[in-house]
């Protein structure tokens, strides 16, 4: 069965300087491959967070993703700035065989509105 990626909130509002959580769950970890968060779509989309061990300033995972059965890939963005506004997508990839990972499913997106403090 096809993996489903769920982003329950269509939008969230956050005051500049505050933190916000972007929720994402998946129905399966198979086929194996990473899960990444992007802002925007298409060629210009920006990688925001990857659950592959790298450090991303101001962003951390919410759940313990070292659990082998973890299906929660929500993230917390701290010290939000107006530049963080946009639509965020949680994307499941299938690992590539000597080629780049292949995107297999994306969540519906969560629009982040940044309010003036």
């Amino acid at each position: 069965t096809e993996v489903k990626v769920t982003q329950p909130e269509k939008s969230v509002s956050v005051a500049a300087g505050d933190s916000t959580i972007l929720n994402c769950t998946v129905t399966s970890l198979l086929p194996v491959g990473p899960i990444r968060w992007y802002r925007g779509v298409g060629q210009s989309r920006l990688l925001i967070y990857s659950f592959t061990g790298e450090h991303f300033p101001r962003i951390r995972n919410v759940s313990d993703t070292t659990k082998r059965n973890n299906m929660d890939f929500s993230i917390r963005i701290s010290n939000v700035t107006p530049e963080d506004a946009g639509t965020y997508y949680c994307v499941k990839f299938q690992r590539g065989s000597s080629e780049p990972d292949t995107e297999i499913q994306s969540g519906g997106g969560t629009e982040v509105y940044v309010l003036a403090k």
Epitope: L29, L30, P31, V32, P34, F51, T52, G53, D64, T65, T66, K67, R68, N69, Q94, R95, S97, S98
Partner: antibody
Framework: EVQLVESGGGVVQPGGSLRLSCAAS????????MSWVRQAPGKGLEWVAG????????YYPASVKGRFTISRDNSKNTLYLQMNSLRAEDTAVYYC???????????WGQGTLVTVSS | SYELTQPPSVSVSPGQTARITCSGG??????YAWYQQKPGQAPVTLIY???KRPSNIPERFSGSSSGTTVTLTISGVQAEDEADYYC???????????FGGGTQLTVLG
């Protein structure tokens, strides 16, 4: 520099118990899943236990399930392996290993020898 | 018995290329790694996530995958590469970490 130092090995009689420790340093221990891997004399590697970063979830192969218990104390940066009902076939060098994001191993300790013999 | 299959031994002359294969895991549920072990020493991770090399590992070690088979390639083999090489995996479908039985690499001459 990542360092993993095992201790607690020794000689124990069949049916006996032993607790191994692994002291970790050089990285944020509480952020990494950890595992124990063993190697019987002249044999290959065998994974025997894994634990999530927070310590709530543990994993075992059928060969040791119910006899071995992996645990951790993140305040002490220490990983443990409690081994009960030991058998001769549990004789091996036991290594602790740090897990990558996808549960492979990137750093290994030097190992501690466990001998089960009467 | 080991869940992953690799040849018991491989021999190669210095400067040549050695290839060690590993099979047996489902491509959709497995990640692979390669570990080197010299006599009396702990294993050292050469490759993880199929083809990622730790920063302290020489570039002559590389990993690749094709279907259900993964391969460790050692280019320009040196005498100090003589060791046992283990294929290891993580199986997401069973939450386990299987290993291959190991391959003894002999550097001739």
């Amino acid at each position: 520099e990542v360092q993993l130092v095992e201790s607690g090995g020794g000689v124990v009689q069949p049916g006996g118990s032993l607790r191994l420790s692994c002291a970790a340093s050089g990285f944020t221990f509480s952020s990494n899943a950890m595992s124990w891997v063993r190697q019987a004399p002249g044999k290959g590697l065998e994974w025997v236990a894994g634990i999530s970063a927070g310590g709530s979830d543990t994993y075992y192969p059928a060969s040791v399930k119910g006899r071995f218990t992996i645990s951790r104390d993140n305040s002490k940066n220490t990983l443990y392996l409690q081994m009960n009902s030991l058998r001769a076939e549990d004789t091996a060098v036991y290594y602790c290993a740090r897990e990558t994001w996808n549960h492979l191993f990137d750093y290994w300790g030097q190992g501690t020898l466990v001998t089960v013999s009467s | 018995s080991y869940e992953l299959t690799q040849p018991p031994s491989v021999s190669v002359s210095p400067g040549q290329t050695a290839r060690i294969t590993c099979s047996g895991g489902s491509y959709s549920s497995y990640y692979y790694a390669w570990y080197q072990q010299k006599p009396g020493q702990a294993p050292v991770t050469l490759i993880y996530s199929d083809d990622k090399r730790p920063s302290n590992i020489p570039e002559r070690f590389s990993g690749s995958s094709s279907g259900t088979t993964v391969t460790l390639t050692i280019s320009g083999v040196q005498a100090e590469d003589e060791a046992d090489y283990y294929c290891g995996g993580y199986d997401q479908s069973s939450y386990t970490n299987p290993f291959g039985g190991g391959t003894q690499l002999t550097v001739l001459g």
